[in-house]
């Protein structure tokens, strides 16, 4: 069987939801010594980056300027060390936002509820769309989808303090082209005293998985790598 290197990790820097005409940055984290990284869009080659010097950095950043609906979709990356290629990374969905109009978001029965009450978010957008998306700030990967002509419902079930936080909704024209975000609606859940200390607070930082962790190799890392190599040989 054909030998391949481990698959790289693909990430969006700061967020995978990029306003139209703004720049998107995707990171491909592979391995030290990789001489070439390729970014693929919808299965086709989109961009190539060659790190300098390759042995000193474990990945690259791909900058996608002037985001639009034609550049929104599924991205993946691969890398090469010598003649050997890696497996393809997982797919990353890159979304363009701020298309067309702004939806409105309301919550029922209201923004202040008690633990155990059932909550429903309602998102409305008058322009033609059929899919609506609800996101909790700090949890932007946990997208809820709902369908409707001009508005959609997002039933939450009986809530706990874990549901508290700020929510926004989008109208979606396709999977990768979203409207402007609605104004945020802050849900406050009281009660559920035994869980209060464990309840998440509103994160003011971006999602932790939406950061690029590319590192430059230091002398210490080289020493550790050499020590690890020696230890492996001793074990053999």
């Amino acid at each position: 069987p054909k030998q391949t290197l481990p698959k790289p990790i693909i990430r969006a820097e700061s967020t995978y939801m990029v306003p139209k005409e703004k720049q998107a940055t995707l990171c491909c984290q592979g391995s030290y010594g990789a001489v070439e990284y390729q970014l693929h869009f919808e299965g086709s080659l989109f961009a190539v980056e060659r790190p300098k010097p390759p042995e000193r950095i474990n990945g690259v950043k791909f900058h996608i300027p002037d985001m639009n609906s034609r550049k929104a979709g599924r991205y993946s990356c691969i890398y090469r060390v010598g003649e050997l290629w890696s497996e393809r990374s997982d797919l990353l969905d890159l979304v363009v936002t701020e298309m067309y109009d702004t939806p409105t978001l309301s919550v029922h029965p209201g923004p202040e509820v008690t633990s155990g009450e059932k909550v429903t978010f309602y998102c409305r957008l008058d322009t033609a769309t059929s899919m609506f998306l609800l996101l909790k700030e700090g949890r932007s990967r946990d997208v809820q989808r709902s369908y409707g002509k001009v508005q959609a419902e997002f039933p939450m079930g009986p809530v706990t303090t874990a549901h508290r936080g700020s929510y926004r909704c989008f109208g979606s024209y396709n999977n990768y082209a979203w409207s402007f975000p609605s104004e945020p609606v802050k849900l406050l859940v009281t009660g559920d005293i035994e869980n209060t200390s464990l309840a998440p607070t509103d994160p003011t930082f971006p999602d932790s998985w939406d950061t690029c962790l590319l590192t430059r190799e230091t002398g210490l890392q080289k020493d550790l790598a050499l020590w690890d190599h020696t230890a492996q040989n001793l074990l053999r």
């Epitope: 029965p109 209201g110 155990g116 009450e117």
Partner: antibody
């Protein structure tokens, strides 16, 4: 204090339409859902629908969807319900009630449909 | 639609007596249940929201509780003004639905 003012009575002919009003005061009108509820003489309560004045989001009971239209006028803090193609079955008391939890209720408007 | 089965439909009781009204929900409604009081002139007032929270200004003799899908309103010691109609209301899932009502009469 929160108040929801409704006209005491309306008399209309069968086949006509009527627009019932509910004037809110004592709170921020655009911050709360407004519900409409029907009660026929000697009967129980039926939810017609609700509207959020801030977003114009509406939600109707399917039973009333073709007949009732909910609107608001933010400038006067007034919610409206238009009922069309009226029959004697629509003779009832109609209440408006604030909030998703129905915390404050109007006094109700008695609608009589009669020729 | 969620059915709210309210019982009893009428109840005769004496001043000072303790009474309990019940509503059974046909589907899960969590704690999204109100108890309403309707005067003979049609005035409607909310007594209890979120199953067990007492509205401000409502006497402490009124209390709400839940056991599974059964929701109860208890009046610990009846007073003369309590002899009116009572309704439960679920606001968990639209269409929001009411119980058929309980007429509380003086014995």
């Amino acid at each position: 204090q929160v108040q929801l003012q409704q006209p005491g009575a309306e008399l209309v002919k069968p086949g006509a339409s009527v627009k019932l009003s509910c004037k809110a005061s004592g709170y921020t009108f655009t911050s709360y859902w407004m519900n409409w509820v029907k009660q026929r003489p000697g009967q129980g309560l039926e939810w017609i629908g609700m509207i959020h004045p801030n977003s114009d989001i509406t939600n109707y009971n399917e039973k009333f969807k073709s007949q009732a239209t909910l609107t608001v006028d933010k400038s006067s803090s007034t919610a409206y319900m238009q009922l069309s193609s009226l029959t004697s079955e629509d003779s009832a008391v109609y209440y408006c009630a604030r909030h998703g939890r129905f915390d404050y209720w109007g006094q109700g408007t008695t609608l009589t449909v009669s020729s | 639609d969620i059915q709210m089965t309210q019982s009893p439909s009428s109840l005769s009781a004496s001043l000072g007596e303790r009474v309990t009204l019940t509503c059974r929900a046909s589907q899960d409604i969590g704690s999204s249940l109100n108890w309403l009081q309707q005067e003979p002139d049609g005035t409607i007032k909310r007594l209890i929201y979120a199953t067990s929270s007492l509205d401000s200004g409502v006497p402490k003799r009124f209390s709400g509780s839940r056991s599974g899908s059964d929701y109860s309103l208890t009046i610990s010691s009846l007073e003369s003004e309590d002899f009116v109609d009572y309704y439960c209301l679920q606001y968990a899932s639209s269409p929001f639905t009411f119980g058929s009502g309980t007429k509380l009469e003086i014995k």
